[in-house]
């Protein structure tokens, strides 16, 4: 089996001109492509992987919401030669981009890492943004976390920082098959320089006091750790059909955002080079973009995610 191979970390790693092919090893019978797009109120970016996969052919699309950070995940696996270039990895252009002057800052100030490398998202290096409220949601907390995508034996991880609705969340996360967006929230100006070691203690919650064990011996009960492994294999054509909601994300259980997935097949690779006169669009991340007035729904099976803000 021969598959396309590329890795995209909010750059052009999977854009058309950088496409590679790779011969899969024995026993490998699927090509895979996975894309995860993340959107903050100040912009969006995507990570993607193409290569030789494992599991069964099929599709899996999922929309996720972590305290106002939106994520959209797509996995596509197929069993023909070089079939893994159907997802559109291009983030939709904004028209006009960067129109944040239309939003009233709410006083909160956070570091923002949208498509920045780990080196550029250290401590107080990244840009500072003013938070604003969008679509009836209040964004007064700051977030520091990571998005991780694992597919085709490759793991891609990028930092995510920005404004969120929650001010106290600790090591919260949302997941899809081989996809995770996780991190912590905080309150206060530029508080999200580094929340990796944030504990579950909060000013509002008294610390847990550990009592000494009883002196009388008792039979010990060992708690069983149930470890669950996430497979990157997609179930056959399972698509989360979900619609946008304005419900506030729960502190304790981040939920799947309802998002309607509208998907068309991309242009066939064996057909014309352009696929019906439009750009083939099979690949290429446009760095990152502000989403202040993004298109509402994706076209051409894209990895775009619906905007919360916008006119």
């Amino acid at each position: 089996l021969e598959c396309y191979s590329c890795v995209q970390k909010a750059d052009d790693g999977c854009s058309p001109h950088r496409m590679k092919t790779v011969k899969c090893g024995p026993g490998v019978d699927v090509c895979t492509e996975a894309v995860g797009a993340v959107e903050t109120i100040h912009g969006q970016f995507s990570v993607a992987v193409r290569g030789c996969g494992s599991g069964i052919p099929g599709k899996n699309d999922r929309g996720l919401d972590l305290h106002g950070l939106l994520a959209f995940f797509q996995l596509q696996q197929c069993s023909e030669d070089r079939c893994n270039a159907k997802l559109n990895l291009t983030l939709r252009g904004l028209n006009p981009a960067g129109n944040e002057s239309a939003y009233e800052p709410n006083g909160a100030e956070c570091y923002s890492c949208v498509g920045l490398s780990r080196e550029k998202c250290q401590g107080s290096m990244p840009p500072v943004v003013n938070c604003y409220n969008a679509s009836g949601r209040v964004y007064k907390g700051c977030f520091d976390g990571n998005v991780t995508l694992t597919a085709a034996n490759v793991t891609v991880s990028l930092p995510v920082r920005g404004c969120v609705q929650d001010e106290t969340c600790t090591r919260d996360g949302v997941t899809g098959p081989g996809f995770t967006l996780s991190g912590s929230c905080c309150q206060g100006p530029r508080c999200n320089a580094d929340l990796r070691n944030k504990t579950y203690f909060s000013p509002r919650i008294p610390p847990l006091v550990l009592l000494p064990p009883p002196t009388t011996a008792a039979p010990s009960t060992r708690a069983q750790n149930s470890s669950s492994t996430t497979s990157t294999a997609a179930p056959t054509t399972t698509t989360s059909i979900i619609k946008p909601t304005t419900a506030q994300a729960s502190h304790t259980s981040p939920h799947e955002m309802d998002l309607e997935v509208i998907q068309e097949e991309g242009a066939s690779l064996s057909g014309g080079a352009a696929g019906h006169g439009g750009t083939a669009g099979h690949g290429g991340a446009a760095g990152h973009q502000d989403r202040s007035n993004m298109e509402k729904y994706p076209g051409k099976g894209g990895a775009q995610i619906p905007a919360k803000g916008g006119s």
């Epitope: 854009s15 058309p16 939709r92 028209n95 080079a273 352009a274 006169g277 760095g287």
Partner: antibody, heavy 117, light 112 residues
């Protein structure tokens, strides 16, 4: 029908500047990676520069780095190439090309740039 | 000196099969990057002939075929016709140069 129409070529002295334009139609320009490719008289094709759909990612050939600037205006469906500090070896027909499935699937007819004293 | 190496010329008679080679290195074709072929008829702009190593855009006759192996690629034209007389260029991405690279071009002459 996809169309790419270059303009702005002409005669210029060494050290001078020119700005080439490429008007695009028949496809969603704002979704397309675009490129400039040139061909000196009687010679082969030479890639000059790439620009991503949003304009955030740009590449240049070593031969033009620091002298040429590629840009785009998605609201006008137009690609640009600002050429400064022109040299005799920059004399060529300049083509704008759209990137489709991994390749330059549509090309303009080209505009001739002549650098001579 | 082009990064991708092609023979400067090739020729054949009508009906014959002609092959044009394109040799690269470990930073372009050998790195796994896909290869494309362009045809440039005299006095016209280049036209995409083969993309993604061996795929034909709609409208390109199946007389044209492409293949790739290791650090080289080749374009084969069977049932040669007089209208195939043109310059042919191969192209790929190059990791080291961080850009697209072309072969020097092969001038195909149809004899007789």
């Amino acid at each position: 029908e996809v169309q790419l129409l270059e303009s702005g070529g002409g005669l210029v002295q060494p050290g001078g500047s020119l700005r080439l334009s490429c008007a695009a139609s028949g496809f969603t320009f704002s979704n397309a990676w675009m490129s400039w490719v040139r061909q000196a008289p009687g010679k082969g094709l030479e890639w000059v520069s790439y620009i991503s759909s949003s304009g955030s990612t740009i590449y240049y050939a070593d031969s033009v780095k620091g002298r040429f600037t590629i840009s785009r205006d998605n609201s006008k469906n137009t690609l640009y190439l600002q050429m400064n500090s022109l040299r005799a070896e920059d004399t060529a027909v300049y083509y704008c090309a759209r990137e489709g499935l991994w390749a330059f699937d549509y090309w303009g007819q080209g505009t001739l740039v002549t650098v001579t004293s | 000196q082009s990064v991708l190496t092609q023979p400067p010329s090739a020729s054949g008679t009508p009906g014959q099969r002609v092959t044009i080679s394109c040799t690269g290195s470990s930073s372009n074709i050998g790195a796994g990057y896909v290869v494309h072929w362009y045809q440039q008829l005299p006095g016209t702009a280049p036209k995409l002939l083969i993309y993604d190593n061996n795929k034909r855009p709609s409208g390109v006759p199946d007389r044209f075929s492409g293949s790739k192996s290791g650090t080289s690629a080749s374009l084969a034209i069977s049932g040669l016709r007089s209208e195939d007389e043109a310059d042919y260029y191969c192209a790929a991405w190059d990791d080291r140069l961080n850009g697209a690279v072309f072969g020097g071009g092969t001038k195909l002459t149809v004899l007789g």
